[in-house]
């Protein structure tokens, strides 16, 4: 439970904090877990303990192993373990998974990439930043304190970012690098399960025999660009094109609109010269996208000739 993984590259500085916390006044002793041998506190040693911190200046592959820290107070002792792995430097640009720190996400509004573990070190600005091993250049990139700010973030900015800085210990300088993945969240758009605005579920639409009638299927899918979004009509559960009634046609193409910033589509069903048999059919408005499908059913009823009021949303 009180064990922490730490990793670094050979010939770089690595500083590890004891996983057990205590007041600054508490003493912390460090040991090689395997041998129980105490780690010296004298700074002339390459590996030495400095309170809560264990310092490898610089680290060597042979330093890999488990280290024990004991936080001692007048009333209790707390034990923690630091599992340290030091890797050989890669000859190429590739940063293996085991050297990657946690992935961070950014968006247009927030695009800070913090340099992992930097707070443990005695460093001075500016930080150097690399993306997929290429030094970052251009006004869009700003190294600010312990983080990188990217202006006008786009999906292409996703990738692996490495920060490089110098740790200073008693006048000696040691290099440190740390890499993490950055993903871009598209805050401009989102996708929802389709929401049908019209017709209402089980709506009764009044029509006049012999006249033309239009039914509009309208649905919204989210904000921004929508994938695989469509609205369409079915007759008795069959596609309009397969139903084989030339008087009933679905308008070609879909009209895209934006309602309160939402991406919406509508499809008009045109019934020419309404007949009695059309009243027996079930008209289904379907809205679909990647999330799924929603269906609203409409039926037609004969408009009473003496009723001149418009009851488009009249329910029985």
């Amino acid at each position: 439970k009180f064990s922490k993984q730490s990793w670094g590259l050979e010939n770089e500085a690595l500083i590890v904090r004891c996983p057990r916390q205590g007041k600054p006044s508490y003493t912390v002793d460090w040991y090689y877990s395997q041998t129980n041998k105490s780690i010296p506190t004298q700074e002339r040693n390459r590996v030495f303990a400095s309170g809560q911190l264990l310092k490898f200046l610089p680290a060597a592959v042979a330093d890999s192993g488990i280290y024990t820290c004991i936080v001692r107070s007048p009333t209790f002792n707390r034990t923690g373990y630091a599992n340290v792995t030091i890797y050989k430097k890669q000859s190429d640009c590739n940063v293996p998974d085991y050297l990657m720190y946690s992935t961070v996400s950014g968006s247009e509004k927030n695009s800070k990439i913090y340099c992992p573990t930097i707070d443990l070190y005695n460093w001075t600005a500016p930080l150097e930043w690399f993306k997929n091993c290429q030094a970052l250049q251009g006004s869009r990139y700003r190294a600010h304190k312990s983080f990188l700010v990217i202006d006008n973030v786009m999906t292409e900015d996703a990738g692996d970012y490495t920060c490089k800085f110098i740790h200073n210990e008693n006048g000696a300088n040691y290099s440190v690098t740390a890499t993490r993945s950055f993903t871009v969240k598209d805050e401009q758009g989102f996708s929802l399960f389709p929401v049908i605005g019209a017709p209402a579920q089980n709506e009764i639409k009044e029509v006049e025999i012999g006249k033309n009638a239009n039914l509009t299927c309208s649905a919204c899918f989210g904000k921004g660009t929508q994938f695989l979004a469509a609205v369409l009509w079915q007759l008795n559960g069959t596609k309009i094109t397969d139903f084989g009634e030339p008087r009933i046609q679905q308008e070609e193409g879909q009209n895209q609109s934006f309602s309160n910033g939402l991406a919406c589509l509508d499809m008009v069903l045109r019934i020419a010269d309404v007949k009695e048999e059309d009243l027996l059919l079930q008209y289904d408005c379907l809205a679909l996208n990647l999330h799924g499908l929603r269906r609203h059913t409409v039926r037609l009823s004969r408009k009473n000739p003496i009723d001149h009021h418009s009851h488009h949303h009249h329910h029985h």
Epitope: T155, E156, A158, T183, V184, D186, T225, F227, L228, A230, L286, L288, L290, H291, G292, L293, R295
Partner: antibody, heavy 116, light 107 residues
């Protein structure tokens, strides 16, 4: 754990009918699209069509419209791909895939061999 | 129908080398593009979705970029298990379509 388990390999003669299955488990079967993908020997992936099991609504790629039928039985969380009259050119590996924002889970594939 | 064209058809590289695969759409698909890896006798495996998002459990050496009509899958340093066929797929519009595939083989 989300799983799609497909029925076993089939060897058929031209003109015969066939129905292969894809059983979903570990998720709400009715709430996700199921797609079917064909891969002919040594060739690439071809999207055939899709079904929304909660509604049984299907959508086909134009190349497969009228050639196959996609259906589902939500009571047993199973999607189907069927042929009424097989041809030698239907010989292929057929995969089902769940779509949840992308084709995120795939069945192991069903090999269909049509030969006289 | 949106046509996806992948290039090159075959890429011959050695382990440790960088692989760059291209996918071009006949019309804009925004960022509705996915990449899959397929090994012989196995079902395809999702690597990247929405052009640049790594799927769960996919190593950091795989990265996707691009939007609109031009997309790239990059494998920063090829591991022996990465030699396979890679497909791009658009899910912007109906019908969903795949590219014809790029085979990454050992040089």
């Amino acid at each position: 754990e989300v799983q799609l388990v497909q029925s076993g390999a089939e060897v058929k003669k031209p003109g015969e009918s066939l129905k292969i299955s894809c059983k979903g488990s570990g998720y709400s079967f009715t709430s996700y699209w199921i797609g079917w993908v064909r891969q002919m020997p040594g060739k690439g992936l071809e999207w055939m069509g899709i079904i929304y099991p909660g509604d049984s609504y299907t959508r086909y790629s134009p190349s497969f419209q009228g050639q196959v039928t996609i259906s589902a039985d939500k009571s047993i969380s199973t999607a189907y791909l069927q042929w009424s009259s097989l041809k030698a050119s239907d010989t292929a590996m057929y995969y089902c895939a769940r779509i949840g924002g992308m084709f995120d889970y795939w069945g192991q594939g069903t090999l269909v061999t049509v030969s006289s | 129908e949106i046509v996806l064209t992948q290039s090159p058809a075959t890429l011959s590289l050695s382990p440790g080398e960088r692989a760059t695969l291209s996918c071009r759409a006949s019309q804009s698909v925004a960022n509705a593009l996915a990449w899959y890896q397929q090994k012989p006798g196995q079902a395809p495996r999702l690597l990247i979705y929405k052009a640049s998002n790594r799927a769960t459990g996919i190593p950091a050496r795989f990265s996707g970029s691009g939007s609109g009509t031009d997309f790239t899958l990059t494998i920063s340093s090829l591991e022996p298990e990465d030699f396979a066929v890679y497909y791009c797929q658009q899910y912007y519009g109906w019908p969903i379509t795949f590219g014809q595939g790029t085979k990454v083989e050992i040089k």
